[in-house]
């Protein structure tokens, strides 16, 4: 790991050991300044492995709303607009960090949680397994 | 929004207004119990819109390492294994939350930050724009 020199102006922390509790400012800083969300917003429809987006809501989690991708077809869309089953639509998954209220229903106390979300779908060549 | 009944056993919070500072336990709880990471690990190579993964490291961020996808080609791979430029490989992007050390170099004080990451690539039909 990388050793970070401690800033003398840091807030005091009661517990220096893991598992450790830290202070987090929930006033989100958005780094996505140069992005054009319009450009990628319709990929789910234009893809050869199109997907639908499902809303997952959990008030005990921050962020409370997460969108999950579900591939529309087992196969992929070919040049004629038909589903080609020689190829497969598969979800691209990513592990993300969320905050889970702990103890439950507490507005100011959380625990970091790692969850796996499907972000979209891609078209892959299936691996052929010869079985007995 | 959904109103959450407050648990009487919650820790006290000095500031009830936004921007608010909350307590976060960094002992990560992993919800990804039923997943098989091996299955999706090679999609980046088998996809018709393959991608490379680039390591982005920042010690002032938590998690400090994030992997960014970059599509290998402008076009997509066809059935013959050649790049077909009638279609386009595009990145699937997702906004994720990370923790940024604030003030800098402080081990126990963070601010939530939203960043856009490319998770993988998908193959789309390009939109044709007629220009002067």
């Amino acid at each position: 790991g990388i050793t970070i020199p401690r800033n003398p102006g840091c807030p005091n922390s009661e517990d220096k050991n893991f598992p450790r509790t830290v202070m987090v400012n929930l006033n989100i800083h958005n780094r996505n300044t140069n992005t054009n969300p319009k450009r990628s917003s319709d990929y789910y429809n234009r893809s050869t492995s199109p997907w639908n987006l499902h809303r997952n809501e959990d008030p005990e989690r921050y962020p409370s709303v997460i969108w999950e991708a579900k591939c529309r077809h087992l196969g992929c869309i070919n040049a004629d607009g038909n589903v080609d089953y020689h190829m497969n639509s598969v979800p691209i998954q990513q592990e993300i960090l969320v905050l889970r209220r702990e103890p439950p229903h507490c507005p100011n106390s959380f625990r970091l949680e790692k969850i796996l979300v499907s972000v979209g779908c891609t078209c892959v060549t299936p691996i052929v397994h010869h079985v007995a | 929004g959904i109103t959450i009944p407050r648990n009487p056993g919650c820790p006290n919070s000095e500031d009830k207004n936004f921007p608010r500072t909350v307590m976060v336990n960094l002992n990560i709880h992993n919800r990804n119990t039923n997943t098989n990471p091996k299955r999706s690990s090679d999609y980046y190579n088998r996809s018709t819109s393959p991608w490379n993964l680039h390591r982005n490291e920042d010690p002032e961020r938590y998690p400090s390492v994030i992997w960014e996808a970059k599509c290998r080609h402008l076009g997509c791979i066809n059935a013959d294994g050649n790049v077909d430029y009638h279609m386009n490989s595009v990145p699937i992007q997702q906004e994720i939350l990370v923790l940024r050390r604030e003030p800098p170099h402080c081990p126990n004080s963070f601010r939530l930050e939203k960043i856009l990451v490319s998770v993988g690539c998908t193959c789309v039909t390009p939109i044709v724009h007629h220009v002067a």
């Epitope: 450009r39 990628s40 | 599509c71 402008l74 430029y85 386009n88 990145p91 390009p126 044709v128």
Partner: nanobody
Framework: QVQLVESGGGLVRTGGSLRLSCSVS????????MGWYRQVPGRQRELVAM????????YYADSVKGRFTISRINANNTIYLQMNNLKPEDTAIYYC?????????MGQGTQVTVSS
């Protein structure tokens, strides 16, 4: 806003040569390409040749390989399509294109007619 300016079409005899040129201005990313499509009325648009903006990789349709050459001058984002040994079946409207991932920008087109 992407803008494309084409020039160089015309009438030529079978076996003759023509050179098309096109300059692009506007937002150009590192993962983009410039090229030429052609269209004969009533037929599907065909990708003729393409060159990658940064890598310089080129692509040619099988029907033009060995006869057409695409090249690019990076300084002013201009591409050229040198067309040699032209055939009557090369007659079409040629459109300059700029391809950003997910978006294909097409110019107004220039007519190329090859007479026998």
């Amino acid at each position: 806003q992407v803008q494309l300016v084409e020039s160089g079409g015309g009438l030529v005899r079978t076996g003759g040569s023509l050179r098309l040129s096109c300059s692009v201005s506007g937002d150009i990313s590192s993962q983009s390409a410039m090229g030429w499509y052609r269209q004969v009325p009533g037929r599907q648009r065909e990708l003729v040749a393409m060159i990658h903006t940064t890598k310089g990789d080129t692509y040619y349709a099988d029907s033009v390989k060995g006869r057409f050459t695409i090249s690019r001058i990076n300084a002013n984002n201009t591409i050229y399509l040198q067309m040699n040994n032209l055939k009557p079946e090369d007659t079409a409207i040629y459109y300059c294109t700029h391809n950003e991932p997910g978006d294909l920008y097409m110019g107004q087109g220039t007519q190329v007619t090859v007479s026998s």
